[in-house]
Interface confidence: low
């Protein structure tokens, strides 16, 4: 349905509050270095313009596309060239090239200071003094640090942020009430950002066929009672929503997401018995709830898949008639029967099935050729099962911190060219899989673990794409989305790597170590561990453990000393010398 004025249409659909929030998010995700006040000014100008278009859709410029309107507004920023360099060249282009240009300049690792949390009383005062500005600041700070954050979901986070302050700033013990809520929002927010980044990478790097395959598998697991046609409709709609959000079309994305939630709630009977409690909630909460809804129970009487996909003489005929539909149906049928499999495994199985049909349907006796196709799945299923089993055993044996260290060593040996901060960040997150998934029952472990690992490894791929340093990483990241994790798992010690020269400065520590939080201390120690492995890639576990134990003892000793700095100055060089000797 076409509208005379797109901006008026979206303003009316979304309402002023959501409209302004989404425009602020869009601008903050594009111009990540601009000051808050500059963005607020631009958003207010766009909002005032939208209101004139609501009043009269024929008014001047109201017929322009949102990309044109928003792009023109962004290009009015005076300091564009100084702040963003070549990104300013985007403004010389016409739509749609201009928007594509802005998208290409989104920075996944912007050079922004870490967010420091002020004292609770300071935050509560700011919240009470100007609630609207306080919440806008939250949207701005999150959006500029996470340029692919799922915008309608960010509005939901902002609503929860507001609710936390409204409740806790009136509590007797404000800090005890507020800080756990803020920690939870921070952790959930980082996870949400990373999950969305994988969706955008899937769409942008591998195309909508890859995303649709992912969505078929995931929705079929969630909604095993829904018919294939119903799942296909949801997949088509969901693909549109995420394509829009990943493309910076945040108003359309939020509007279409609301429409999808409405459709799902109106058609619960043909989708899932689990939607009811979501559908009673207000819009933002409802959409979030639907996205996170648990898997419905599997129908009791599902027949064997072999009849239609192996034993039938019509397999090649069906495949030839509509390859993607037939493969989509296969994926749907397999996924609804296997909530215990990761989505990535299901996609590997579909890929293996497709490869077999491609080969066998050209053979002299196709049926004989593909008769054993399901046997082919066995090793594909066993591999992630073994991986989860081995790593959960290791996690239970070591605990999270030491498990992270084991992964740090493992991944530094695989790809030592990758920057130390990236290796630390990625390995710490890989290590969190233990606490997140290993406590789950067997049937939930693999989907939890492997799909989480896919999200974390996508972060590695995204950071590496910005500054490529390793052919191995490029290969694993670009060749196949579904085989990324197995590709990284398969990497061994990089024999071609020339060890990094020893730099004593890297292993020089000061008394400020003692005032760091436990997490910051861990990061310091893990940074040193990565540097050690880069210096001695062939060091044994025992050697590294010895050095790290000595390091912990040295830091503990100096942090207990009366003159901490003097202790670090004296003991530090001894630690370095002893470490070099231990690793020689």
């Amino acid at each position: 349905d076409t509208h005379k004025s797109e901006v008026a249409h979206r303003f009316k659909d979304l309402g002023e509050e959501h409209f302004k929030g989404l425009v602020l998010v869009a601008f903050s995700q594009y111009l990540q270095q601009c000051p808050f006040e500059e963005h607020v000014k631009l958003v207010n100008e766009v909002t005032e313009f939208a209101k004139t278009c609501v009043a009269d859709e024929s008014a001047e410029n109201c017929d322009k596309s949102l990309h044109t309107l928003f792009g023109d507004k962004l290009c009015t920023v005076a300091t564009l060239r100084e702040t963003y360099g070549e990104m300013a060249d985007c403004c010389a282009k016409q739509e749609p090239e201009r928007n594509e240009c802005f998208l290409q300049h989104k920075d996944d690792n912007p050079n922004l200071p870490p967010l420091v949390r002020p004292e609770v009383d300071v935050m509560c005062t700011a919240f009470h003094d100007n609630e609207a500005t306080f919440l806008k600041k939250y949207l701005y700070e999150v959006a500029r640090r996470h340029p692919y954050f799922y915008a309608p979901e960010l509005l939901f986070f902002a609503a929860r942020y507001k609710a936390a302050f409204a409740e806790c700033c009136q509590a007797a013990d404000k800090a005890a009430c507020l800080l756990p809520k803020l920690d939870e929002l921070r952790d959930e927010g980082k996870a949400s950002s990373a999950k969305q980044r994988l969706k955008c990478a899937s769409l942008q790097k591998f195309g909508d066929r890859a995303f649709k395959a992912w969505a078929v598998a995931r929705l079929s697991q969630k909604f095993p009672k829904a018919e294939f046609a119903e799942v296909s409709k949801l997949v088509t709609d969901l693909t549109k929503v995420h394509t829009e959000c990943c493309h910076g079309d945040l108003l359309e994305c939020a509007d279409d997401r609301a429409d999808l939630a409405k459709y799902m709630c109106e058609n619960q009977d043909s989708i899932s018995s689990k939607l009811k409690e979501c559908c009673d909630k207000p819009l933002l909460e409802k959409s979030h709830c639907l996205a996170e809804v648990e898997n419905d129970e599997m129908p009791a009487d599902l027949p064997s898949l072999a009849a239609d996909y192996v034993e039938s003489k019509d397999v090649c005929k069906n495949y030839a008639e509509a390859k993607d539909v037939f493969l989509g149906m296969f994926l749907y049928e397999y996924a609804r029967r296997h909530p215990d499999y990761s989505v990535m495994l299901l996609l590997r199985l579909a890929k293996a099935y497709e490869a077999t049909l491609e080969k066998c349907c050209a053979a002299a006796d196709p049926h004989e050729c593909y008769a054993k196709v399901f046997d082919e799945f066995q090793p594909l299923v066993e591999e992630p099962q073994n991986l989860v089993k081995q790593n959960c055993e290791l996690f239970e044996q070591l605990g999270e911190y030491k498990f992270q260290n084991a992964l740090l060593v493992r991944y530094t040996k695989k790809v030592p060219q990758v920057s130390t901060p990236t290796l630390v960040e990625v390995s710490r997150n890989l290590g969190k899989v233990g606490a997140k998934c290993c406590k789950l029952p067997e049937a939930k472990r693999m989907p939890c673990a492997e799909d989480y690992l896919s999200v974390v490894l996508n972060r590695l791929c995204v950071l590496h794409e910005k500054t490529p340093v390793s052919e191995k990483v490029t290969k694993c990241c670009t060749e196949s989305l579904v085989n990324r994790r197995p590709c990284f798992s398969a990497l061994e010690l990089d024999e071609a790597y020339v060890p990094k020269a020893f730099n004593a400065e890297t292993f020089t520590f000061h008394a400020d170590m003692c005032t760091l939080s436990e997490k910051e201390k861990q990061v310091k120690k893990q940074t040193a561990l990565v540097e050690l492995v880069k210096h001695k890639p062939k060091a044994t576990k025992e050697q590294l453990k010895g050095v790290m134990d000595n390091f912990a003892a040295f830091v503990e000793k100096c942090c207990k000393a009366d003159d901490k700095e003097a202790c670090f100055a004296e003991e530090g060089p001894k630690f370095v010398a002893a470490s070099q000797a231990a690793l020689a």
């Epitope: 799945f377 591999e383 398969a490």
Partner: nanobody
């Protein structure tokens, strides 16, 4: 159960070449990492070469054979090959092919679940 059968062994002079084949049946082949191991009389079994599952685009070799041996796979024929050039007397052994579903690529014998009987390679000086 996956059956693994090797062929192509024989007697060859030092400096010569041989091509070993390993064909699987019983279960399809594409999802297995494949490896070659060897065992000389009175010695431990040792890793020779491995190739990853699917397209086989990742390979691994023992240092002693690097640059002389090449492992490859043909998924359409359910076969993995070991091309051995510049053979030396110390390459004399029974060469055994194995399949692993433990990991996409492995050099560890304990991660291989299905083994062939082996084929004898003798290099004379």
């Amino acid at each position: 159960q996956l059956q693994v059968v090797e062929s192509g062994g024989g007697l060859v002079q030092a400096g010569g070449s041989l091509r070993l084949s390993c064909t699987t049946s019983g279960r399809a082949f594409i999802g297995y990492a494949m490896g070659w191991f060897r065992q000389a009389p009175g010695k431990e079994r040792e890793f020779v070469a491995a190739i990853s599952w699917f397209a086989g685009d990742t390979t691994d070799y023992a240092n002693s054979v690097k640059g002389r041996f090449t492992i490859s796979r043909d998924n359409a024929k359910n076969t993995v090959y070991l091309q051995m050039n510049s053979l030396k007397p110390e390459d004399t052994a029974v060469y055994v092919c194995a399949a692993s579903s433990a990991r996409p690529l492995s050099s560890r014998s304990d991660e291989y679940h299905y083994w062939g009987q082996g084929t004898q390679v003798t290099v004379s000086s």
